[in-house]
C-alpha cells in the first residue's frame, strides 16, 4: 500500500534535490509539517507554527511551502518518505509518499575504433543503469547498457554518435570516423 | 461527540488469529491518523499500530509481520488482525485517535485480548 | 526506542497538596512530551500535549513544564478525584513510547 501511490522521484549522487509536494499551499490553518524517513520510521524535518523548524540533520531543509531539500544526495537516501500536513485540530489535511531513487551520473561515452576491421565500440564507464544508443550518420544502429561494439561495412567515411543515458542524466559523444581505402589503423 | 467503540477481543490460543475492530464516530474519520495501544496486565502502555489518515502503517518490532493494521473510511472503522499470536499480547486493546505528533487525543473503552492455553 | 521513565512510582497527598511528577526522556525530544491520566476502570485521557500545553476540559489545576529530556506535571491544588495513575509518553519519533506510570494516592 505504501509503495503503490507513491510518487517515483529521481536524484542524482552527490546532488541537491527538493521534494516539493504536490497541489499544496501553506495557509494560517497549517499547524504542523512532518516529513519522515519510513524505512526507520523517523521524523527528519518538521515546521510547526511559532516553534523553531525541526531537522534532524544539516543535509536537510525545509522551506516555508513545505518542500523538502536533501543536500549532497547519498545512497542510503535512497528511501520512501512520507510528509504529512495537519491543521490546528490534528486533521491530516494532506499526505504524500515519495519513492526517492538514486543513480549515479553517467560518464561521457568513448568511442573508439580500428579500421583494420571497421569494428568500432562505445563505452560508457560511470553511471547507474546507463543505456547506451549508437548512431551512424543520425540512424539508429544499437542499444546496449554499457559497450556496443559494432562493425561497419557501408562505407569507410562515416560520423558515429553514441548516447549514455539514465533517469537523472544524459551524456554524448561523436566522432567523424574516416578509414583510408586498404587502411591500417 | 467523538466516540470510538472496540470489538473482536476474547481468550485465544497461543499461535492463534483475533480480528478487532474500531468503529469510529462524531468525527470525519478518513481524516485522522489512528492507533491501537495496548495496556499490559502490569498497567504497562505499548504502542502497537499506527496508520495514517491515508493508509501508511507503521508497526513497532514486537508485532511487525504478526499484526495488520487496516481501515475502512467508507464504514469509518478501523481493524487490527492479529496473528501468531504470543501470552506476551495479553492485554487490554484500546484505539485511539491521535492528533499531529502521536498525542492520543481521544481513546476508545478498550477490547480485552487474552492469549492462554 | 526512547526510554521514559517516571518518578516516583507512588505517591501519597492530601487533598490541597500541590503535587510534582517527574518524567525522563533517555535521549533529548524536545518539547514533543505528552501526559495521560488514567483513573481506576477507565481509558486514558489526555492532560496536556507538548509538554506545556492544556487540553479543553482539563481542570486548570493540571500544568506541565520542561524540554529536552526532562519534564513535570504539576497539580496545583490536588483533590481527591484526582487519584489514579499519570503517564508520560514521547511524541518525537516512532514507536511512541510512554512511561511506567506515577501512582497517585490520597492519604
Known amino acids: 500500500k505504501e509503495i503503490t501511490n507513491a510518487l517515483e522521484t529521481w536524484g542524482a549522487l552527490g546532488q541537491d534535490i527538493n521534494l516539493d509536494i504536490p497541489s499544496f499551499q501553506m495557509s494560517d490553518d497549517i499547524d504542523d509539517i512532518k516529513w519522515e524517513k519510513t524505512s526507520d520510521k523517523k521524523k527528519i524535518a518538521q515546521f510547526r507554527k511559532e516553534k523553531e523548524t525541526f531537522k534532524e540533520k544539516d543535509t536537510y531543509k525545509l522551506f516555508k511551502n513545505g518542500t523538502l531539500k536533501i543536500k549532497h544526495l547519498k545512497t542510503d537516501d535512497q528511501d520512501i518518505y512520507k510528509v504529512s500536513i495537519y491543521d490546528t485540530k490534528g486533521k491530516n489535511v494532506l499526505e504524500k509518499i515519495f519513492d526517492l531513487k538514486i543513480q549515479e551520473r553517467v560518464s561521457k561515452p568513448k568511442i573508439s575504433w580500428t579500421c583494420i576491421n571497421t569494428t568500432l565500440t562505445c563505452e560508457v564507464m560511470n553511471g547507474t543503469d546507463p543505456e547506451l544508443n549508437l548512431y551512424q550518420d543520425g540512424k539508429h544502429l544499437k542499444l546496449s547498457q554499457r559497450v556496443i561494439t559494432h562493425k561497419w561495412t557501408t562505407s569507410l567515411s562515416a560520423k558515429f554518435k553514441c548516447t549514455a543515458g539514465n533517469k537523472v542524466s544524459k551524456e554524448s559523444s561523436v566522432e567523424p570516423v574516416s578509414c583510408p581505402e586498404k587502411g591500417l589503423d | 461527540e467523538v466516540q470510538l467503540v472496540e470489538s473482536g477481543g476474547g481468550l485465544v490460543m497461543p499461535g492463534g488469529s483475533l480480528k478487532l475492530s474500531c468503529a469510529a464516530s462524531g468525527f470525519a474519520f478518513s481524516s485522522y491518523d489512528m492507533s491501537w495501544v495496548r495496556q499490559t496486565p502490569e498497567k504497562r502502555l505499548e504502542w502497537v499500530a499506527y496508520i495514517s489518515g491515508g493508509g501508511f502503517t507503521y508497526y513497532p518490532d514486537t508485532v511487525k509481520g504478526r499484526f495488520t493494521l487496516s481501515r475502512d473510511n467508507a464504514k469509518n472503522t478501523l481493524y487490527l488482525q492479529m496473528s501468531s499470536l504470543k501470552s506476551e499480547d495479553t492485554a487490554m486493546y484500546y484505539c485511539?485517535?491521535?492528533?499531529?505528533?502521536?498525542?492520543?487525543?481521544?481513546w476508545g473503552q478498550g477490547t480485552l485480548v487474552t492469549v492462554s492455553a | 526506542d526512547i526510554v521514559m521513565t517516571q518518578s516516583p512510582a507512588t505517591l501519597s497527598v492530601t487533598p490541597g497538596d500541590r503535587v510534582f511528577l517527574s518524567c525522563r526522556a533517555s535521549?533529548?525530544?524536545?518539547?514533543?512530551l505528552h501526559w495521560y491520566q488514567q483513573k481506576s476502570h477507565e481509558s486514558p485521557r489526555l492532560l496536556i500535549k507538548y509538554a506545556s500545553q492544556s487540553i479543553s476540559g482539563i481542570p486548570s489545576r493540571f500544568s506541565g513544564s520542561g524540554s529536552g529530556s526532562d519534564f513535570t506535571l504539576s497539580i496545583n491544588s490536588v483533590e481527591p478525584e484526582d487519584v489514579g495513575v499519570y503517564f508520560c509518553q514521547n511524541g518525537h519519533n516512532f514507536p511512541p513510547t510512554f512511561g511506567g506510570g506515577t501512582k497517585l494516592e490520597i492519604k
Open positions: 535521549q533529548s525530544i524536545s518539547d514533543f
Open positions: 485511539a485517535r491521535q492528533g499531529a505528533n502521536w498525542e492520543l487525543v481521544y
